[in-house]
Interface confidence: low
């Protein structure tokens, strides 16, 4: 099943997030992703746990997953590079870089997103945008078009309360509020964008969604700048 959903959001403006990628398994949406360079998409390492021997591809330039759109293009994946420290049973280091079979054809609907290199926390309360093609309600309805939601960043101390994530949120992770509006398992790999800059990647760990006591967890890209640069080099 696809990993992910946007709960309590709305349909995004078509092609207004040209960095947005759909990571696909055997032609079906699996995870979100974000174009960070002409030939590289950043996603979540756990996304590929479901892939087995299936064909992984990346769809760029899309708003609708099914309808013909002039900017849409499906790319084969030349190389999948999960973070070397990612493990199936933890949410730590949940990053994956996918090298496309060729450089993406850039245009108004396909463009890399600048990512944060300064390793400091986003201020609590900052509104950040998260987008994805995951299911949109608890009944499991899957959207055909890209959805998004604005979420306030939650401070780490609150997120680490015993009633919340009980100390699991390291300095390399960040949280956003999840009171009925939330990202969830399957928007995994998608971007958390604050002030037009990629700050986080939706983690693909299993958790309840839309519950204010279980905030959304995001991998802080700035904390992995050295690794990202080393792979893209």
């Amino acid at each position: 099943p696809p990993r992910g959903r946007i709960l309590g959001g709305r349909e995004a403006e078509a092609h207004a997030r040209p960095y947005m990628a759909s990571v696909q398994l055997n032609g079906a949406h699996l995870c979100g992703g974000v174009l960070v360079a002409e030939q590289w998409v950043l996603s979540a390492a756990h996304c590929l746990e479901d892939a087995a021997d299936g064909k992984v591809q990346v769809l760029l330039g899309a708003h609708s997953l099914s309808q013909p759109e002039p900017s849409k293009r499906l790319y084969d994946v030349l190389r999948a590079v999960p973070h070397p420290d990612s493990q199936p049973d933890t949410i730590d280091h949940d990053l994956l870089l996918l090298q496309l079979s060729e450089k993406a054809t850039l245009g108004p609907a396909v463009r890399p997103l600048p990512w944060q290199r300064v390793d400091r926390d986003v201020a609590p309360g900052t509104l950040c945008d998260v987008a994805g093609w995951g299911i949109v309600n608890h009944a499991g309805r899957r959207p055909d078009s890209l959805q998004h939601v604005l979420l306030p960043v939650l401070d780490r101390a609150t997120c680490n309360r015993r009633t919340h994530h009980d100390g699991a949120i390291t300095e390399r992770l960040m949280c956003a509020e999840s009171n009925r509006r939330d990202s969830c398992k399957g928007d995994s790999g998608g971007p958390l964008v604050c002030g037009g800059v990629l700050e986080g990647v939706v983690t693909s760990g299993s958790r309840v969604c839309g519950n204010r006591k279980k905030p959304g967890i995001y991998t802080r890209v700035a904390s992995y700048a050295a690794w990202i640069d080393s792979v893209l080099a």
Epitope: H15, Q24, G27, A28, K55, P68, P70, L74, P108
Partner: antibody, heavy 119, light 112 residues
Framework: QVQLQQSAAELARPGASVKMSCKAS????????VHWVKQRPGQGLEWIGY????????DYNQKFKDKTTLTADISSSTAYIQLSSLTSEDSAVYYC????????????WGQGTLVTVSA | NIMMTQSPSSLAVSAGEKVTMSCKSS????????????LAWYQQKPGQSPQLLIY???TRESGVPERFTGSGSGTDFTLTISSVQAEDLAVYYC????????FGGGTKLEIK
């Protein structure tokens, strides 16, 4: 180089069904949608629909939705079009086509398959 | 669906003459985000498959002779052959690919 090789001409009775093929070579079959276009004798071109071989997703021109079934076999890099409940209106040349590398004009065409419906 | 209308339906010219044919779309095929016209022209010679001539309304496909020129924007487009050759005998179709895919009815070019 990219090639789309279509099956031989078909003669069919009214009410019958016919299935034509389009074998792709020279590129990765699952990376591009395969489109089908109809051309009645002495007439213009009509877009029927397409299939995404990697997912099986199909999109049809509403006019042909009930008449046509598009399928694909990845193992043989072949796309198929099946026409059902044939009438004389279905007598035509059917082309498969593939878009260009980045955009949706039709850069590559099969040679066409002529279907003749006759009692 | 966007409707495409071509005119004339047929025309006959002598070799060496200049010829123009028209294609009109029922709504604009100019995509505002990239300022490109999503319009192509094809040539179909007798007994053959269509061949791509022009895309983006005015960009010649590789190998297409310079005598073929596409122009226009929005809803009105023209294909011009500056000096018709005997081998240009064909039907010419315009095609929009902005919203699904539709073709014009074609213009048949005959050589006197």
């Amino acid at each position: 180089q990219v090639q789309l090789q279509q099956s031989a001409a078909e003669l069919a009775r009214p009410g019958a069904s016919v299935k034509m093929s389009c074998k792709a070579s020279g590129y990765t079959f699952t990376s591009y949608t395969v489109h089908w276009v109809k051309q009645r004798p002495g007439q213009g071109l009509e877009w029927i629909g397409y299939i995404n071989p990697s997912s099986g997703f199909t999109d049809y021109n509403q006019k042909f939705k009930d008449k046509t079934t598009l399928t694909a076999d990845i193992s043989s890099s072949t796309a198929y079009i099946q026409l059902s409940s044939l009438t004389s209106e279905d007598s035509a040349v059917y082309y498969c086509a593939r878009r260009g590398v980045n955009w949706s004009w039709f850069a590559y065409w099969g040679q066409g398959t002529l279907v003749t419906v006759s009692a | 669906n966007i409707m495409m209308t071509q005119s004339p339906s047929s025309l006959a010219v002598s070799a060496g003459e200049k010829v123009t044919m028209s294609c009109k779309s029922s709504q604009s095929v100019l995509y505002s985000s990239n300022q490109k016209n999503y319009l192509a022209w094809y040539q179909q010679k007798p007994g053959q498959s269509p061949q791509l001539l022009i895309y983006w309304a005015s960009t010649r496909e590789s190998g297409v002779p310079e005598r073929f020129t596409g122009s226009g924007s929005g809803t009105d487009f023209t294909l011009t052959i500056s000096s018709v050759q005997a081998e240009d005998l064909a039907v010419y179709y315009c095609h929009q690919y902005l919203s699904s895919w539709t073709f014009g009815g074609g213009t048949k070019l005959e050589i006197k």
